[in-house]
Each structure stands twice: as structure tokens, then as C-alpha cells.
Interface confidence: low
């Protein structure tokens, strides 16, 4: 299908453009250009006869058109009036017409633009301003720009006038920015030079610097004053209510106790109007005051809260010390001071944080302490712990169980058997208990202020009959020499005897033998090889006895000093060497040769066919315990003798 | 005097395991926070995670949390990373850097020399 | 986590002159009105060395031709005057919280 494609489609006024004709049926008789729609002899452009190769203008012709043998057309120094359709008329050999039509938008370059203003010295938060983009320019887009960003959403920003205007209602001191606007069309964009709004504020409340309000006797007072204020404000001092001078800076040298009192710093902006002032209270001390501590944190929560103790009153020129727990601070990643020792800061408190905190001014004479000062840390609760620790009583008896968290405040207990909620109590008492009594006994603790809960669980179990008792270790593989195991027989009963069994026999006297914990506990020191046994515990009571199941000790050991074998160090030329190594060793070691200190196979066996004289040297076995990380060597010298001289064997 | 010893270079096929050591002298690790930093070659600095020995609670970075695991053993006075899974995006050098106690204000002013670890089939 | 934006990335400085480059925080690393913000100097190689903690005091030990400056979010390390064994890359870190970040690093080279 025959097309017609601009390029460009949006066409600046001074520019060209080509009319670019897709799919061009083949034997022509010519074509013709029209403007419009349609093709009207009144509004030929130009026609074009192949045969003659001979372009005829039209009525529309200006003098800026050129037609290409191809049937594109391109038009030069476009001008506003050429905006709209071109229609393409395609003239056959067979004289059937076809016809395609496109178009093209002219739009003018865009001139630099300019911003006017209705307000150059607008106050805040009193008057808006309008900024307006000029010049109007139709089809054209306008942008605004604050500080080379496109602007933020704001409500007191609107634009109108088809974005032509943008308002600033109640301006303030942060609109103080670079403005610029954009004008767009689809052939141009150019920006303004940047206007900066210049917004009248303040001025705000004078800050008086140093924040000091302690001096001693005989110091020079230097007060500063200072107020946001555009344009900058002008300063007067009051001295207890008398002007004293109209400068930014007070200076009195060599103050006395009479220089006490109220002193006001007043500034004035002389374009708003407005007046605004601040008092601060100075006390000159003959001597430095008895200090005093300040926290920001007066309940801080353990691991999570910082404390910052300052020492009041803060003087010019002193030196401030500390003291916890009436010593000198100790060093510490959690104990900070500022750099003039007024402010102590204890990082992440924990509970051992308490104090008492102690600070103290240094004068000429001696060390003013201020009082002690205690910190009310919250902490916990911990984990509960329940006792006594037995897991097993007999019907009859009274169980009587008592939880215990640290915690400040003191925790809040609660008991729960099987799930089910007893008594808000530390202790839990219940008489004369039975086989029903046996369940899971929770303590749950509560620090009503840091609203942490801990609980713990205990399993009881009554019982006439004893259980079958079990052995725990606290080292599955111990190694030989090294090492020591302890076997705990559990669980622990309440008025049971404990017993314990090596290979089926009562225990041998042995100074590495230890029982401890009620015989609960059987520990053996520096274990050996020969410690590898059935080790059985037993528990007994006045009606029954019990026997756990037995726990062999695996000790690790070795590698000793290897043996090769056969013991033969002379052979004769032609026999085969078959040397094997054994180590005593648990667990089995790694194994490797080395003839004459060259590296051979990793086997516990050497073999070597047929051996001549080269294979004379010294032969050296490695055994290597990965588990106990200990290694040994032996090694052999091996002679070979040439068949015929006669070997004298030797061990 | 403060010393970090960390264990030797490392040269390792991918998808396997490795596991680096740091050993202290000159303080007691249970005093301080152990920590470990990444720095792949000709690259910059990258924090991995740290270990309080005294307790072993340990703290990682997100894209860390199942790739390295800090421990401690504070009987050895030697800190641990174990990298697992290794790809090539984990061939780096490793470092290891106390933290706290005998550092002024939570700093970090020793280093061990660093291991490399080389990922490669 | 907070990022820590380090520049320039490079730096050319003659022997003698001042070199001066920037850590930008993304948030305040301050606690208790401190930049918990420090200096590291790394030679290839080697592992990093501690020039500067807390944003201004000198470790023991480094010259005091190093300096740091700053709070909050912006920072400063200075170097004044260069020496040819300055040549090192240079990175700042926070351990305001974790994770503890460190910036991309400044090289520093001599014209």
C-alpha cells in the first residue's frame, strides 16, 4: 500500500522537511504533488512526467519545493502557512490512479524566556508572590524549575494560567531559591535565566552563646548574640533591664558578683519591623557552687538505654572530675566524657551500672563533691530458676517449689502446671502429692516495667518406682592425656542413693577417679586408653533400685611409635620388599612411606618387586591421628645386597 | 602488645566449605566484639558480621545471614568464619578486627594480615 | 543501613601540598552529639591502618599531619603537607549502628 511518511513530523519554522513515499507501484506514467486532502488542480504543488523526466509546477508551487525521482517530495525554509496535508498523486502505465496522503506540524522557534515578578521583597509568611513566564507563546508548554528541580508538591505553590504563572502563597524563608521556567514546543525548549526570590524574614528568636550561665569571680564574660533575620538584624544588650550597647557581642572584663543578674539581647530587623528578644540569667560565684548531677534517664532499661549524667552548673575554665562507686572511672568502651568532663555517658547500661555516680568541681583550695547519685537501672528478669533441682519424689511427700529472676523491679510470679494457671506466688506448696501431681511445672516471671517475660519449665515426676536412670558426658571422645570426662547420672531424685559401675565392677580406687555431687558425678582425670570401659550408674532409693543402660568411653589415642614388620633389614637382590606398619591408635591412623625422604603411597603396606642394590636407604613410615592431631614415625634401613655375596641378617 | 593471627591462604573448588581463624594475643577476646570485613580484588571494604565472644551472639549483614558463620572459642582466644556454598563471588581477602574494649571509641585500630580465599575449579 | 558516599573517587596532589577528601553520610552517624565516623588508610596489600577515629582524634602513633573534621553527615579527612608514603586508598566508616558500613574509598596518587 502506497504511504506517505514525514520526516520530520513536527517541522521548525526555517527548517525542511521530506515528504519520504513508501511502496511506490513500478511502471509509472508520473505523479503529482497537492496540498490538502485531496487532489485539486487548484492546489497542484508540482507534477512529474517519468518518461520526459520533466517536473511542471502548480498553483501552489513556491519556489521551495524539489521533487525526487522516487515521487519524495522536500520542502525548504518551512514556513508557518505549510502546517497540514500533502496528497500524493500516483499516475500508472496502465493509467489507474493511486493515491496516499501525510502531513506535517510547522511550529515557530521558541524565543529565550524571561520571568517577571509582583513582589521583590515579599515577607514571610505575610505576603505571595506571582511569578509569570513571558512571553505568551501559543502551543507552547510552560515548566517551572526551583533550584534546577522540577517543583515539589506543595499546597502553598499553584500554578495557572496555563502554567504560565506560578504563585507562592505565605512565602517563607525556604523559598528562598533559584527559579526558572521552560517554554516547550515540539521543536524547542528553552529556559530563563535564573531569578533568585529574595524573602524578608525574622528576626527569630535571639540564641545567646556561650549557653554557660555560671562564672566564677574575676573571669572576662564575652555573651554573643545572634538571630536568623533577613536582612540581618541589628543587636541591643539590657543589663537588668538598662540599655547597655547597640553591638552584636557584650564584653565586660574581670566580673565580680555584682555582674549577677538578667541580660537581654534584643534584635530588630529593620525591613519586617518586628523586635524579638531573649534573657539569660548570668550567676557570677565567688567560689565555684557545691555541683550537682543531672540525667537525662532517670529509670534507663538494661542493654537498651544510654544514661548521660552532667555536672551542674556548668563554669568557664574548670576542671570537672568523676567518681563510681568512690573511685576514679575505670576504663570502659561504655564510659563516655565530653570533651570538657561535664557529661558522663554510660553506653548501653547493664545492671552493674548503679553507682553511686559522684562528680566534682575542681577550685583553687580543694574539690567540691556533689551527692551521690544512684542509677534505678531495669533489668531482667533473667531466666527463673526453680529449686530445689530434683525431678523426682515419691507419693506422700510435700512438694514444695520456690522461682527465683533477677530482675528490677522485683518480678511478679506466676505458676503453671501442665499449661494451666495455679497461683500468682514465688513459691508453690502442694501437700501430700500423688501419681496425679507428675507434669510439666512452669514458672513464669514478669518485670511490670520493662514488660519482659521469662519463663522455665521443670518436669516432675512422682513416682514410687525409680526411673531407669541414663549417664550424660560432657565429652563424647575425649583424648588420652589430655582430657577429662564427667559422667552425671541422671536425673536427679530427691533421698536416692547414687551408684556406679566400671565393666560390671565397683569402682577401683584411683586418684583420677572423682565422685562428687552426691555421687552423682564420676569424673576421670587424664584419661588413658585402659579408660575404655562399660560404664553403668545406679540409682536406689528405701522401696526401689535402678541400673542405666551401660556407656562405653571412647578415648582417642595414638598413633604410638609405629613397628614395621618383618624385622629383616638385609635382603638379597631379586627378592620382593613387603614391609607393613602398624601403629596403636584410636581412631585407625593415616598411614604413608618414605624411602630416603621421598614421598610414597598413603598404605599401611610397602611393597616393591624384585629389589636390586638402588633400592638400599632408609625407610620411613608416618602415622598421623586426625582426631587427636598427634603424629609418629619410625625408621628402617634397608640393605640389598647383589645375588651371590651371602647377606648377614640382621634385626 | 595486641596480635591477630589468622590462618594461611585457602584455595578452594566451588560449592565446597571453608572455615578461617583468627587468633588473639595481647587480650582476652570474652573483653571485646570480634568482627570480620570482606575485600574482593581491587575493591573496597565490606562488613560481614561480628561475634560478642563472651556470650556467642553473633550479628551479620542480610546478604551475609546463611553464607558465613562467626564463632568463638574463647579457651583458644581464636575467632572463626566459616563461609559455605563458595562461588566465585567469594574469592577475597578476609580480616579479622577487634572491636570495643581495647579500642578507643569503638574503632577499629588492629587488624589481623588478612587470609585469601580463592575460588576456583 | 547507612550509606557513606566517599569523594572524590581519585586524587592527584603534589608532594608538599594539602590533600582533602569527603565522607557523606546518608544519615547522622552522631551519638550524644559525636561522629562515630573513622579513618582507615589501606596500602596494597596490607590491611587497613587506623588514622583518625571519632571524627577528629588521632590515633597514637600517625603523624599529625592527618586531621579529621566534621558531624552529623558530613566529614573530612586532611592531609597537610602530602608526603610520597601517603599513597594509599583512604575509607571512612561508621559504627554509629549495624551494620557498620564503610564508604567506596579515595585514592590518593602524587602528580
Known amino acids: 500500500k502506497l504511504t506517505i511518511e514525514s520526516t520530520p513530523f513536527n517541522v521548525a519554522e526555517g527548517k525542511e522537511v521530506l515528504l519520504l513515499v513508501h511502496n511506490l507501484p513500478q511502471h509509472l506514467f508520473g505523479y503529482s504533488w497537492y496540498k490538502g486532502e485531496r487532489v485539486d488542480g487548484n492546489r497542484q504543488i508540482i507534477g512529474y512526467v517519468i518518461g520526459t523526466q520533466q517536473a511542471t509546477p502548480g498553483p501552489a508551487y513556491s519556489g521551495r519545493e524539489i521533487i525526487y525521482p522516487n515521487a519524495s517530495l522536500l520542502i525548504q525554509n518551512i514556513i508557518q502557512n505549510d502546517t497540514g496535508f500533502y496528497t500524493l498523486h500516483v499516475i500508472k502505465s496502465d493509467l489507474v490512479n493511486e493515491e496516499a496522503t501525510g502531513q506535517f506540524r510547522v511550529y515557530p522557534e521558541l524565543p529565550k524566556p524571561s520571568i517577571s515578578s509582583n513582589n521583590s521583597k515579599p515577607v514571610e509568611d505575610k505576603d505571595a508572590v506571582a511569578f509569570t513566564c513571558e512571553p505568551e507563546t501559543q502551543d507552547a508548554t510552560y515548566l517551572w524549575w526551583v533550584n534546577n528541580q522540577s517543583l515539589p508538591v506543595s499546597p502553598r505553590l499553584q500554578l495557572s494560567n496555563g502554567n504560565r504563572t506560578l504563585t507562592l502563597f505565605n512565602v517563607t524563608r525556604n523559598d528562598t531559591a533559584s527559579y526558572k521556567c521552560e517554554t516547550q514546543n515540539p521543536v524547542s525548549a528553552r529556559r530563563s535565566d535564573s531569578v533568585i526570590l529574595n524573602v524578608l524574614y525574622g528576626p527569630d528568636a535571639p540564641t545567646i552563646s556561650p549557653l554557660n550561665t555560671s562564672y566564677r569571680s574575676g573571669e572576662n564574660l564575652n555573651l554573643s548574640c545572634h538571630a536568623a533575620s533577613n536582612p540581618p538584624a541589628q543587636y541591643s544588650w539590657f543589663v537588668n533591664g538598662t540599655f547597655q550597647q547597640s553591638t552584636q557581642e557584650l564584653f565586660i572584663p574581670n566580673i565580680t558578683v555584682n555582674n549577677s543578674g538578667s541580660y537581654t539581647c534584643q534584635a530588630h530587623n529593620s525591613d519586617t519591623g518586628l523586635n524579638r528578644t531573649t534573657v539569660t540569667t548570668i550567676t557570677v560565684y565567688a567560689e565555684p557552687p557545691k555541683p550537682f548531677i543531672t540525667s537525662n534517664n532517670s529509670n534507663p532499661v538494661e542493654d537498651e538505654d544510654a544514661v548521660a549524667l552532667t555536672c551542674e552548673p556548668e563554669i568557664q575554665n574548670t576542671t570537672y572530675l568523676w567518681w563510681v562507686n568512690n573511685q576514679s572511672l575505670p576504663v570502659s568502651p561504655r564510659l563516655q566524657l565530653s570533651n570538657d568532663n561535664r557529661t558522663l555517658t554510660l553506653l548501653s547500661v547493664t545492671r552493674n551500672d548503679v553507682g553511686p555516680y559522684e562528680c566534682g568541681i575542681q577550685n583553687k583550695l580543694s574539690v567540691d563533691h556533689s551527692d551521690p547519685v544512684i542509677l534505678n537501672v531495669l533489668y531482667g528478669p533473667d531466666d527463673p530458676t526453680i529449686s530445689p533441682s530434683y525431678t523426682y519424689y515419691r507419693p506422700g511427700v510435700n512438694l514444695s517449689l520456690s522461682c527465683h529472676a533477677a530482675s528490677n523491679p522485683p518480678a511478679q510470679y506466676s505458676w503453671l502446671i501442665d499449661g494451666n494457671i495455679q497461683q500468682h506466688t514465688q513459691e508453690l506448696f502442694i501437700s501430700n502429692i500423688t501419681e496425679k501431681n507428675s507434669g510439666l511445672y512452669t514458672c513464669q516471671a514478669n518485670n511490670s516495667a520493662s514488660g519482659h517475660s521469662r519463663t522455665t519449665v521443670k518436669t516432675i515426676t512422682v513416682s514410687a518406682e525409680l526411673p531407669k536412670p541414663s549417664i550424660s558426658s560432657n565429652n563424647s571422645k575425649p583424648v588420652e592425656d589430655k582430657d577429662a570426662v564427667a559422667f552425671t547420672c541422671e536425673p536427679e531424685a530427691q533421698n536416692t542413693t547414687y551408684l556406679w559401675w566400671v565393666n560390671g565392677q565397683s569402682l577401683p580406687v584411683s586418684p583420677r577417679l572423682q565422685l562428687s555431687n552426691g555421687n552423682r558425678t564420676l569424673t576421670l582425670f587424664n584419661v588413658t586408653r585402659n579408660d575404655a570401659r562399660a560404664y553403668v550408674c545406679g540409682i536406689q532409693n528405701s522401696v526401689s533400685a535402678n541400673r542405666s543402660d551401660p556407656v562405653t568411653l571412647d578415648v582417642l589415642y595414638g598413633p604410638d611409635t609405629p613397628i614395621i614388620s618383618p624385622p629383616d633389614s638385609s635382603y638379597l637382590s631379586g627378592a620382593n620388599l613387603n614391609l607393613s606398619c602398624h601403629s596403636a591408635s584410636n581412631p585407625s591412623p593415616q598411614y604413608s612411606w618414605r624411602i630416603n625422604g621421598i614421598p610414597q603411597q598413603h598404605t599401611q603396606v610397602l611393597f616393591i618387586a624384585k629389589i636390586t642394590p638402588n633400592n638400599n636407604g632408609t625407610y620411613a613410615c608416618f602415622v598421623s591421628n586426625l582426631a587427636t592431631g598427634r603424629n609418629n614415625s619410625i625408621v628402617k634401613s634397608i640393605t640389598v645386597s647383589a645375588s651371590g655375596t651371602s647377606p648377614g641378617l640382621s634385626a | 602488645e595486641v596480635q591477630l593471627q589468622q590462618s594461611g591462604a585457602e584455595l578452594v573448588e566451588p560449592g565446597a566449605s571453608v572455615k578461617l581463624s583468627c587468633t588473639a594475643s595481647?587480650?582476652?577476646?570474652?573483653?571485646?566484639?570480634m568482627h570480620w570485613v570482606k575485600q574482593r580484588p581491587e575493591q573496597g571494604l565490606e562488613w560481614i558480621g561480628r561475634?560478642?565472644?563472651?556470650?556467642?551472639?553473633?550479628k551479620y549483614v542480610p546478604k551475609f545471614q546463611g553464607k558465613a558463620t562467626i564463632t568463638a572459642d574463647t579457651s583458644s582466644n581464636t575467632a572463626y568464619l566459616q563461609l559455605t556454598s563458595l562461588t566465585s563471588e567469594d574469592t577475597a581477602v578476609y580480616y579479622c578486627a577487634p572491636f570495643g574494649y581495647y579500642v578507643s571509641d569503638y574503632a577499629m585500630a588492629y587488624w589481623g594480615q588478612g587470609t585469601s580465599v580463592t575460588v576456583s575449579s | 543501613d547507612i550509606v557513606l558516599t566517599q569523594s572524590p573517587a581519585s586524587l592527584a596532589v603534589s608532594l608538599g601540598q594539602r590533600a582533602t577528601m569527603s565522607c557523606r553520610a546518608g544519615e547522622s552517624v552522631d551519638i550524644f552529639g559525636v561522629g562515630f565516623l573513622h579513618w582507615y588508610q589501606q596500602k596494597p596489600g596490607q590491611p587497613p591502618k587506623l588514622l583518625i577515629y571519632?571524627?577528629?582524634n588521632l590515633e597514637s602513633g600517625i603523624p599529625v599531619r592527618f586531621s579529621g573534621t566534621g558531624s552529623r553527615t558530613d566529614f573530612t579527612l586532611i592531609i597537610d603537607p602530602v608526603e610520597a608514603d601517603d599513597v594509599a586508598t583512604y575509607y571512612c566508616?561508621?559504627?554509629?549502628?549495624?551494620?557498620?558500613?564503610f564508604g567506596g574509598g579515595t585514592k590518593l596518587e602524587i602528580k
Open positions: 566508616q561508621q559504627t554509629n549502628e549495624d551494620p557498620y558500613t
Open positions: 595481647g587480650f582476652n577476646i570474652k573483653d571485646t566484639y
Open positions: 571519632r571524627a577528629s
Open positions: 561475634i560478642d565472644p563472651a556470650n556467642g551472639n553473633s
